[in-house]
């Protein structure tokens, strides 16, 4: 009698994550009587994938009706494939007994899973930094296979070069992750700037995935202060202005001091935005000169975004 053959015609099968995979297996003879089982891997640590007789295998179905008389097709379909399903699958014939005895295994079919990278997530520094400082942005994407991937950073469309990228794990795995850090030098004009992390992979239909971060979340542009006096009014009052310009973010508190004593405190709110994303604010203080015998020292004190206060002083001359 001819020796039983267990035929797995495909050496390898590749599928996209989320799809179904069909693993083909036929036997050359109905005898000896005994079941077919599917395993992933070989040797003592192999994992049972499908056993017609018992067990609950929710994602695995038989392609043909295995209970049908004279059935020699023991192909299976695994639905909703994930990268974790990758491996070599063996169709194994057993001889019926107590217990069943393994008789012959197919040559195995390697299942390869291609999976798309997740949308890149870009995170910036925890605290704001001022212009001329360098900040780091991190981009992460996960779950892709195969391992080959390209990641590029752009600031306002220009590719960044101060970049460090790692793909993990280094060895063979069912899926991979990428993590990249880009160092970006901030300028005062960066409030409206954007960094983009662009990930390209074989599974993407020609269009890279992009993650973005706005530099407005990472930058602090400290204000310029200028205190000036308007001409004396007829009622002996002097109008002194404090111009606070080119600052970001808007969070700003301004305090007027007359000879070191707090005269008034104001909070910036609902300011119009400059073209470059920064803000300007002007505060006025009326000083009654006739109420003073000596010159008045006026100080405009600005506390911006929780930073130490910045002062600009001005002396109003009181004529004898």
């Amino acid at each position: 009698e001819e020796e039983l053959q267990v035929i797995q015609p495909e050496k390898s099968v590749s599928v996209a994550a989320g799809d179904s995979a069909t693993l083909n297996c036929t036997v050359s003879s109905l005898i000896p009587v005994g079941p077919i089982q599917w395993f992933r891997g070989a040797g003592p640590g192999r994992e049972l994938i499908y056993n017609l007789k018992e067990g609950h295998f929710p994602r695995v179905t038989a392609v043909s009706d295995p209970t049908k008389r004279n059935n020699m097709d023991f192909s299976i379909r695994i639905s909703n494939i994930t990268p974790a399903d990758a491996g070599t699958y063996y169709c194994v014939k057993f001889r019926k007994g107590s217990p069943d005895v393994e008789l012959k295994s197919g040559a195995g079919t390697e299942l390869s899973v291609r999976a798309k990278p997740s949308a890149p997530v870009v995170s910036g520094p925890a605290v704001r930094a001022t212009a001329e400082h360098t900040v780091s942005f991190t981009c992460e994407s996960h779950g892709f296979s195969p391992r080959d991937i390209t990641l590029k950073w752009f600031k306002n469309g220009n590719e960044l070069s101060d970049v460090q990228t790692n793909v993990d794990p280094a060895g063979k795995s069912v899926s991979y992750s990428i993590r990249s850090t880009a160092r970006v030098l901030l300028t005062r004009r960066d409030v409206h700037s954007q960094v983009i992390c662009e990930v390209a992979h074989v599974t993407l239909q020609g269009d890279p995935l992009r993650g973005t971060a706005n530099l407005s979340e990472a930058i602090r542009v400290p204000p310029f202060l200028e205190v000036t006096q308007q001409s004396m009014r007829a009622d002996n009052q002097v109008n002194v202005t404090c111009q606070v310009t080119k600052f970001y973010p808007q969070r700003l508190q301004l305090t007027w001091l007359e000879n070191g004593n707090v005269s008034r405190t104001e909070m910036a709110s609902a300011l119009p935005e400059n073209k470059d994303g920064t803000y300007n604010w002007t505060s006025w203080l009326l000083v009654n000169v006739s109420a003073h015998r000596d010159d008045v020292k006026l100080t405009c004190q600005v506390e911006h975004d929780g930073q130490p206060a910045v002062n600009k002083s001005f002396s109003v001359k009181v004529s004898a």
Partner: antibody
């Protein structure tokens, strides 16, 4: 799933010509599509692709002479400043469902002859 | 750009012969290699993708192997319908560009 090229004809050197690839059975917004050519008796040559969102990418030799664009059911190849060496059969093809590294569906091709 | 060198450029074989065609990339393309069959006046047909995966509907006598820079297409037992020209095609994941080998013509001995 089918691809059919059209627009191939005899063209004069220095003129322009637009080839079209009409698709059926799938959406152009889901796949990368490519243009290739084959001069008589020669091998296959890659011209360029257009991504699912409509971004074109070209072989380095194209140098701006060819432009790939698409609508919902057709992909076009506009060829400017035709030369005799552009004489070839032009094929359009679709990448496979698993990735952009291979082309599993091809059109039958359309012949372009450039001669004065 | 990556260069793909295919060899031999032509070969003569008989029905039933085992035929091997090789393709070498000028730099590593990992496993991003496809093989196509083309008959005169026809469009190419995909045989193998990702270096070793048989495309659906392609007879199992065709097989592919290799990774990195060296790849092989094997026809285990040549059939009359297999007389054609075979091309390898690479995809480079960094440049995202495609390159073909110059082709191998398989003729009847």
């Amino acid at each position: 799933v089918q691809l059919v090229e059209s627009g191939g004809r005899l063209g004069q050197p220095g003129t322009s010509l637009t080839l079209s690839c009409t698709v059926s059975g799938f959406s152009l917004s889901s796949y990368v599509m490519g243009w290739f050519r084959q001069a008589p008796g020669k091998g296959l040559e890659y011209i360029g692709i257009i991504s699912s969102s409509g971004s074109p990418y070209y072989a380095s030799w194209v140098n701006g002479r060819f432009t790939i664009s698409k609508t919902s059911t057709t992909m076009d190849l506009k060829m400017n400043s035709l030369r005799s060496e552009d004489t070839a059969t032009y094929f359009c093809a679709r990448v496979g469902p698993l990735g952009v590294d291979y082309f599993n569906i091809w059109g039958p091709g359309t012949l372009v002859t450039v001669s004065s | 750009d990556i260069q793909m060198t295919q060899s031999p450029s032509s070969l003569s074989a008989s029905v039933g012969d085992r035929v091997t065609i090789t393709c070498r990339a000028s730099q590593s393309i990992n496993s991003y290699l496809a093989w196509y069959q083309q008959k005169p006046g026809k469009a190419p047909k995909l045989l193998i993708y990702s270096a070793s995966f048989l495309y659906s509907g392609v007879p199992s006598r065709f097989s592919g192997s290799g990774s990195g820079t060296d790849f092989t297409l094997t026809i285990s037992s040549l059939q009359p319908e297999d007389f054609a020209t075979y091309y390898c095609q690479s995809w480079h994941y960094i440049s995202r560009s495609y390159t073909f080998g110059q082709g191998t013509k398989v003729e009847i001995k």
